[in-house]
């Protein structure tokens, strides 16, 4: 009897180990979204970037949803959010309308239940991109740890979107779940 | 009999708890590598930085390997990768060959099976470091969430390596595993 | 008898699952602290920032302590630490004492047992904020993975604190535990 129980226990514990491993390590939501430059707005004002890749190159998503330019949370939890935004200008692109630029990123959270948008993180710099240099470049990185509820949406706003670097290694944002909410 | 089973179960569950805790929390790979400035290349072009500390000061590594200037993945998984690169110049170091600088970092992944190198993340800025100021400084930070396979290698490329700040709190890169691959 | 044992086992395993989930996913320490701008030091020198929110807006803390301007570690482990610091100046604030600025952040660790302070991460830039532009902005982001022991304290030092952006999305720092120490 005791032997039978041990064997049964080993079997159940084995499946429990699999279950625990799967539930803990594999079900954790994440996303890494890279810029889709085929549809970048013009203008120098602050705009929401709605075109992102989620399934090509470095871009990937799991247990989160990408819809209408927003990253949607499917699972309550504490997440680490990050964004890397690169701006660049080459003289061959033409003359800048102004050499004094505000190059900014805003990572925002929208709650559908209470239709409101709040900025979680911002970063950037004012730059003087003079005509003396043929090429200009600048990158922003922001990151932080936030409580997100199912249904909340993360989006990215930038100034001067026409200066965005369209490479997947340059302009991206993402999130990964770190822990549950108590 | 029932009491004996309960006691045995508690004992087995106890060891299971230890095992689960150990396997989950302690076996997760990570690395934090700090610049070894004794062997920095001299040019201003983009170069791969091959000298990093892995076992002194803040530098550490576990369940990953550092070899030939590359951080080698030993365990499949999704990892958060990051890099912080600081550049600095003091007039006592001499006159800059040009005051217009591209200060850049590229975090690259190399697959040995398919010998190819791809940039995962890039960041930086063009800077005008004029002789009017005796000291100049600039830092770049990049970070992102990537799927890495065992045997893949992470390396760091920078422009103007002779301008790197050699402090361990200034120029470093790292990775930590967040979750398994489904 | 065997049926009773199975039922008991399921019940115990169920509670074990709850316990494991709670201990693993919920007890992990974290903090996200946002600047409290009511008490920012003046001057352009390097100062320690002691006023942070821990319980309003995006600010939160769990299984860590905030005291005397320092984030105190309560649980040994490997943590990801990060900081985002924004500086800004508008001409309506008055003329800058100097147009050549060092805008810097230092993330430091203090051990009470051995009263010593060490910089874990630094970042920033020298900037020329000329009077030709009415508004200037610059953000710094740093992040890294560090071994922290119970009782150790994390604090933030910046230069030019009077230029700090007081928004909660602009100037903040934080930490979250990733794994235990072996």
């Amino acid at each position: 009897g005791s032997q039978h129980i041990r064997a049964e226990k080993a079997m159940v514990d084995g499946s429990w180990l699999d279950l625990a491993k799967r539930s803990k390590l594999e079900a954790q939501p994440f996303a890494h979204l890279t810029i889709n430059a085929t549809d970048i707005p013009s203008g120098s004002h602050k705009v929401s970037l709605s075109s992102w890749y989620h399934d090509r190159g470095w871009a990937k998503i799991s247990n989160m949803t990408f819809s209408n330019g927003k990253l949607i949370v499917n699972q309550d939890g504490f997440y680490y959010l990050y964004a890397n935004i690169c701006f660049r200008h080459h003289e061959t692109s033409g003359d800048l309308a102004t050499e004094y630029l505000q190059l900014m990123v805003y990572v925002t959270k929208t709650s559908i239940k209470i239709p409101s948008s709040h900025t979680l993180m911002k970063g950037g710099s004012t730059k003087y991109w003079s005509g003396n240099s043929e090429f200009h470049f600048y990158s922003i990185n922001v990151g932080g740890f936030f409580k997100l509820r199912s249904g909340e949406e993360i989006s990215i706003e930038v100034s001067n979107p026409s200066l965005l670097d369209p490479d997947q290694d340059a302009t991206y944002f993402g999130a990964f779940k770190v822990r549950d909410i108590d | 009999g029932s009491q004996h089973i309960r006691a045995e179960k508690a004992m087995v569950d106890g060891s299971w708890l230890d095992l689960a805790k150990r396997s989950k929390l302690e076996a997760q790979p990570f690395a934090h590598l700090t610049i070894n400035a004794t062997d920095i290349p001299s040019g201003s072009h983009k170069v791969s930085l091959s000298s990093w500390y892995h076992d002194r000061g803040w530098a550490k590594i576990s369940n990953m390997t550092f070899s030939n200037g590359k951080l080698i993945v030993n365990q499949d998984g999704f990892y958060y990768l990051y890099a912080n690169i600081c550049f600095r110049h003091h007039e006592t170091s001499g006159d800059l060959a040009t005051e217009y600088l591209q200060l850049m970092v590229y975090v690259t992944k190399t697959s040995i099976k398919i010998p190819s190198s791809h940039t995962l993340m890039k960041g930086g800025s063009t800077k005008y470091w004029s002789g009017n100021s005796e000291f100049h400084f600039y830092s770049i930070n990049v970070g992102g969430f990537f799927k890495l396979r065992s045997g893949e290698e992470i390396s760091i490329e920078v422009s103007n390596p002779s301008l790197l700040d050699p402090d361990q709190d200034a120029t470093y890169f790292g990775a930590f595993k967040v979750r398994d691959i489904d | 008898g065997s049926q009773h044992i199975r039922a008991e086992k399921a019940m115990v395993d169920g509670s074990w699952l709850d316990l494991a989930k709670r201990s693993k996913l919920e007890a992990q320490p974290f903090a996200h602290l946002t600047i409290n701008a009511t008490d920012i030091p003046s001057g352009s020198h390097k100062v320690s920032l002691s006023s942070w929110y821990h319980d309003r807006g995006w600010a939160k803390i769990s299984n860590m302590t905030f005291s005397n301007g320092k984030l105190i570690v309560n649980q040994d482990g490997f943590y990801y630490l990060y900081a985002n610091i924004c500086f800004r100046h508008h001409e309506t604030s008055g003329d800058l004492a100097t147009e050549y600025l060092q805008l810097m952040v230092y993330v430091t660790k203090t051990s009470i047992k051995i009263p010593s302070s060490h910089t874990l991460m630094k970042g920033g830039s020298t900037k020329y904020w000329s009077g030709n532009s009415e508004f200037h902005f610059y953000s710094i982001n740093v992040g890294g993975f560090f071994k922290l022991r119970s009782g150790e304290e994390i604090s933030i030092e910046v230069s030019n604190p009077s230029l700090l952006d007081p928004d909660q999305d602009a100037t903040y720092f934080g930490a979250f535990k990733v794994r235990d120490i072996d």
Epitope: - | G43, H45, A97, T98, Y100, S162, L163 | -
Partner: antibody, heavy 121, light 107 residues
Framework: QVQLVESGGGVVQPGRSLRLSCAAS????????MHWVRQAPDKGLEWVAV????????YYVDSVKGRFTISRDNSQNTLYLQMNSLRAEDTAVYYC????????WGYGMDVWGQGTTVTVS | DIQMTQSPSTLSASVGDRVTITCRAS??????LAWYQQKPGKAPKLLIY???SLESGVPSRFSGSGSGTEFTLTISSLQPDDFASYYC?????????FGQGTKVEIK
Amino acid sequence: QVQLVESGGGVVQPGRSLRLSCAASGFTFTGYGMHWVRQAPDKGLEWVAVISYDGTNKYYVDSVKGRFTISRDNSQNTLYLQMNSLRAEDTAVYYCAKCLSGTYWGYGMDVWGQGTTVTVS
Amino acid sequence: DIQMTQSPSTLSASVGDRVTITCRASRSINSWLAWYQQKPGKAPKLLIYKASSLESGVPSRFSGSGSGTEFTLTISSLQPDDFASYYCQQYNNYSWTFGQGTKVEIK
């Protein structure tokens, strides 16, 4: 291996022009400043001109200012010296040389070509 | 422009001798001084940069010292391959100048 090969020297009459070339190989040409240095027969070395790695900065010895122009084509890994209004005192072996540091001036010249002879008579 | 004065112009020595060559700048150049060796019909070869740093691959018997206006090149034990001409070269404020050279010949 790291190599610099000069060409374009020859005999030329005073007042005429000549263009020297220096082909670089074995190192990342785009990462380093480049010099021209000359040596008159049985004389010492004289620095002539330098160009930064990106071509934005150029400096000359006073005696050639306004007559000589240093340039580079980073896509072709080639350095040039355009010499106009040549004089008898420009007669020398002309060497191209690589800057030891790409970022800073002042660290010396660590790689030299074999030289090309220019005779003005 | 800064003038560089090398001394002596010619130096006669034997194998195994310790040899010192001096270079003086007309005003301070901090440590921005290099030393070169040149053999007849050949291009110069960098020995020392930034006054005292030994170029990679150069024998350790060569050493440099000095800062400001006075600099020295020392060959601790002269070898047969060391008989050649030696030049100092300064850098200051976007200008480069060489000394007139020192010829080391066999005594």
